[in-house]
């Protein structure tokens, strides 16, 4: 599919001008290559009318220009003094006319309306309000006032001062007669429809002395604004419908076949399932304007979008609307990243977040999307070392693997962690990628004791059991702080006995803290990684207490949730050993499901090409 995009249809009137904008991916090659505008012939082929290399056809001499805007990835063709001969099929494109890097544009130039003398022209947008003013003389002040619409050869009564209203205008028209000082009556039509366009006649009096005034009403369908965004990127639709609809329900819909417009989101709480978690409707301003952001753009998001206002929260005839034509460029610079990450209660997830690699020094942010609160996203962690208090010890943002991707690790998962999260940076390129965390059935793969108490001056050894599925992974222990997790030395103690059906490839890796000090208190993580790609983690809180008086040494493991055994050795060495085999309730049996991608694999695997890219979780 060609990545060039422009307006599908351009309509104008003889004598007027048009400005046609064509979009292209702003790669270095594209920015400098030839841009052209050509007319398609009946037998194929496309005859150049104007190009960025200075060529201008004789047909366009003195009335057209082509301007390239390489920094925006656009070029603009302006054509003036249009005639009906300019109607036809054109292409705007890059490179050679026949190469296919182009977009088809239909230009329709119509004859201007043949208006009667003394005709007042009213040009109003669809869904808006028009006021048709009708002057009259004093002798007709007390006589019937009326407005007719010319249908074919015959005038049809629309409204009159005796109270008649044509059924087509019920509920949206009124006739106002000004105060005695002004010889004027007005007809106000609201929620204008395309079918309202045409010639009107207003009249005061019914005899030969009546006053008449011709009016031509043109109802404009909004020209869609062209929007060109990258696959996996985001788009913002700013919708400003005016203060007169400030208190009316707003909506954004996507046109499907025909005139249908399927609601994407509205202020009444509706959200299309395909956009769940990647769409934000921001709070309305006092003037009724609002914005909608869609992130994680997919191929199928391309199309025509309308925003409007109607009490039903969906498009109805006469809704004031704004329109956009969204093109999703599949030659995206935004790397793939999973849109769904799965984890188990008590387990962890490692989320990969893309950013513009040119902005490696930008601050990285991770926030929790609050869809219900009009799309606020409270910050959870940033790359400068800020972590929301409730997440201390279980959340870390790592700059690795770098080069356009950072990693967020969240452990000690609970069902409350399920939801949608946003990856952001403060760079100029506003990439907002959405990831959904799903909590699924299963047990964490890594086995650690619960909270552990160490004794000042003694040595503490904390075990972490890794199942055989992680045999090829690097295993580590680190101490969590708000800027990351600092690696610590650890010892491989050989195969673990914590897994019932796991072979010699399982591993017990211990963290040893020698001569414990107060500074050792805190959160410790054990985890797996492959290079700079992180997998599962498990967290243990180590508390530090004073040595008990001789003879009353407490040798039970203080508050160790998994109830592991603790031996106090003669050397003052304190070891925590999990009795997983003796008590099989302590650890769930490892259920290796063939089709399950484990978290560490998922965080580095190439993801599905489908719309809902998923990153696997722990065993289910």
């Amino acid at each position: 599919k060609s990545p060039i995009f422009g307006p599908e249809e351009v309509n104008s009137v003889e004598g007027n001008s048009v400005s046609i904008t064509c979009y292209y991916p702003p790669t270095s090659v594209n920015r400098h290559t030839r841009k052209y505008w050509c007319r398609q012939g009946a037998r194929g082929g496309c005859i150049t009318l104007i190009s960025s290399e200075g060529y201008v056809s004789s047909k366009y001499a003195g009335r057209a220009n082509l301007t390239n805007f390489p920094e925006n990835g656009t070029f603009v063709v302006n054509i003036a003094q249009l005639s009906q001969d300019d109607s036809g099929r054109y292409k705007c494109g890059l490179g050679i006319n026949s190469r296919g890097l182009s977009f088809d544009v239909s230009l329709e130039v119509s004859q201007g309306p043949g208006l009667l003398n003394d005709t007042k022209v009213y040009t109003v947008d669809l869904g808006r309000t028009v006021t048709i003013n009708c002057p009259f003389k004093t002798e007709n002040a007390q006589k019937r006032k009326s407005l007719y619409k010319q249908i074919g050869l015959y005038p049809v009564l629309v409204i009159d001062s005796s109270g008649y209203v044509n059924p087509n205008y019920t509920g949206r028209i009124r006739l106002d007669i000004q105060g005695t000082g002004q010889l004027l009556f007005s007809v106000v039509i609201n929620q204008l429809r395309l079918s309202d366009a045409g010639q009107y006649l207003c009249q005061a009096g019914d005899d030969s002395n009546s006053n008449k005034k011709n009016a031509d009403l043109q109802v404009l369908k909004p020209e869609p604004e062209l929007v060109y965004e990258d696959l996996r990127g985001s788009v913002t639709f700013h919708c400003a419908l005016g203060p007169e609809v400030a208190n009316v329900a707003k909506f954004l819909c996507r046109q499907s076949s025909g005139e249908n417009c399927d609601v994407v989101v509205n202020t009444l709480g509706k959200r299309a399932p395909a956009f769940e978690g990647r769409i934000l409707l921001n709070p309305q301003d006092k003037d009724g304007s609002f914005s909608v952001v869609i992130t994680g753009l997919r191929k199928e998001d391309a199309g025509r979008y309308l925003c409007g206002a109607h009490s039903d929260g969906q498009l109805q005839e006469g809704s004031p609307i704004q329109a956009w034509q969204l093109f999703v460029n599949e030659e995206s610079t935004i790397p793939r990243s999973p849109t769904v990450v799965k984890g188990v209660a008590g387990g962890s997830v490692a989320v990969l977040c893309p950013y513009n690699r040119k902005e490696s020094k930008s601050i990285k942010y991770w926030c929790l999307w609050e869809g219900a609160q009009n799309g606020r996203c409270p910050l959870l962690v940033d790359s400068e070392g800020w972590v929301k208090a409730q997440y201390e010890g279980r959340l870390s943002l790592l700059e690795e693997p770098g080069n356009g991707t950072f990693t967020v690790i969240l452990n000690q998962l609970t069902s409350r962690d399920a939801g949608f999260y946003w990856c952001l940076t403060n760079g100029d390129t506003l990439w907002r990628t959405t990831v959904e965390i799903k909590i699924i059935e299963g047990e964490p793969n890594l086995k650690v004791p619960g909270n552990v108490t160490a004794v000042l001056g003694e040595t503490l050894k904390v075990p972490c059991h890794f199942p055989c599925k992680f045999s090829s992974y690097e295993k580590y222990w680190c101490k969590w702080n708000n800027t990351g997790c600092q690696a610590l030395p650890s010892q491989d103690e050989g195969p673990s006995k914590a897994f019932v059906n796991c072979d010699e490839n399982s591993r017990l890796v211990s963290l040893t803290l020698n001569l414990v000090t107060r500074a050792d208190e805190g959160w410790y993580w054990c985890g797996v990684k492959q290079g700079h790609f992180y997998g599962e983690t498990a967290a243990v809180y180590v508390a530090v207490e004073e040595r008990k008086a001789a003879g009353s040494r407490d040798v039970s493991l203080a508050k160790a949730d998994a109830a592991p055994d603790e031996k106090v050795l003669d050397s003052g060495f304190r070891e925590i050993e999990n009795k997983a085999i003796q008590d099989p309730r302590l650890f769930a049996e490892e259920k290796a499901v063939a089709d399950t991608r484990d978290q560490a694999d998922g965080s580095r695997a190439s993801v599905d090409s489908g719309s809902s890219e998923e990153q696997g979780g722990s065993s289910r």
Epitope: R376, E384, G385
Partner: nanobody
């Protein structure tokens, strides 16, 4: 005890400059996002600018963008607001505050979520812009 003390306000001509300071004590200053808000006579609070813990993330209200610059010195536990090209509508009492829960809006910008003036605010410093 948490304390925030603003200073540097005063009278300035339209087009002139002022530099506000906010000295923080009683908490780990470098661990908090900070922001400035202002209150014009008879008006509500208006958020002005915010800054991340390390100073790399700076955000501004549209009304001051391009004219004001927020910065911080974590070694000195001080927040600053450099105000250039001052306008009469900048006349207000300026307060600094710490942000317990930084939030972003639909467009990826900092979103001021409001704050209780009794919650660790200083006395403010008055800025008057008049010829």
């Amino acid at each position: 005890e948490v304390q925030l003390v603003e200073s540097g306000g005063g009278l300035a001509q339209p087009g002139g400059s002022l530099r506000l300071s906010c000295a923080a004590s009683g908490f780990a200053f470098s661990s908090y996002w900070m922001y400035w808000v202002r209150q014009a006579p008879g008006k509500g609070l208006e958020w002005v600018s915010a800054i991340s813990t390390g100073g790399g993330g700076t955000y501004y209200a549209d009304s001051v963008k391009g004219r004001f610059t927020i910065s911080r010195d974590n070694a000195k536990n001080t927040l600053y607001l450099q105000m250039n090209s001052l306008k009469p509508e900048d006349t207000a009492r300026y307060y600094c505050a710490r942000d317990e829960a930084p939030t972003f809006d639909y467009s990826g910008n900092y979103a001021y979520t409001g704050s209780d003036p009794n919650d660790y605010w200083g006395q403010g410093t008055q800025v008057t812009v008049s010829s």
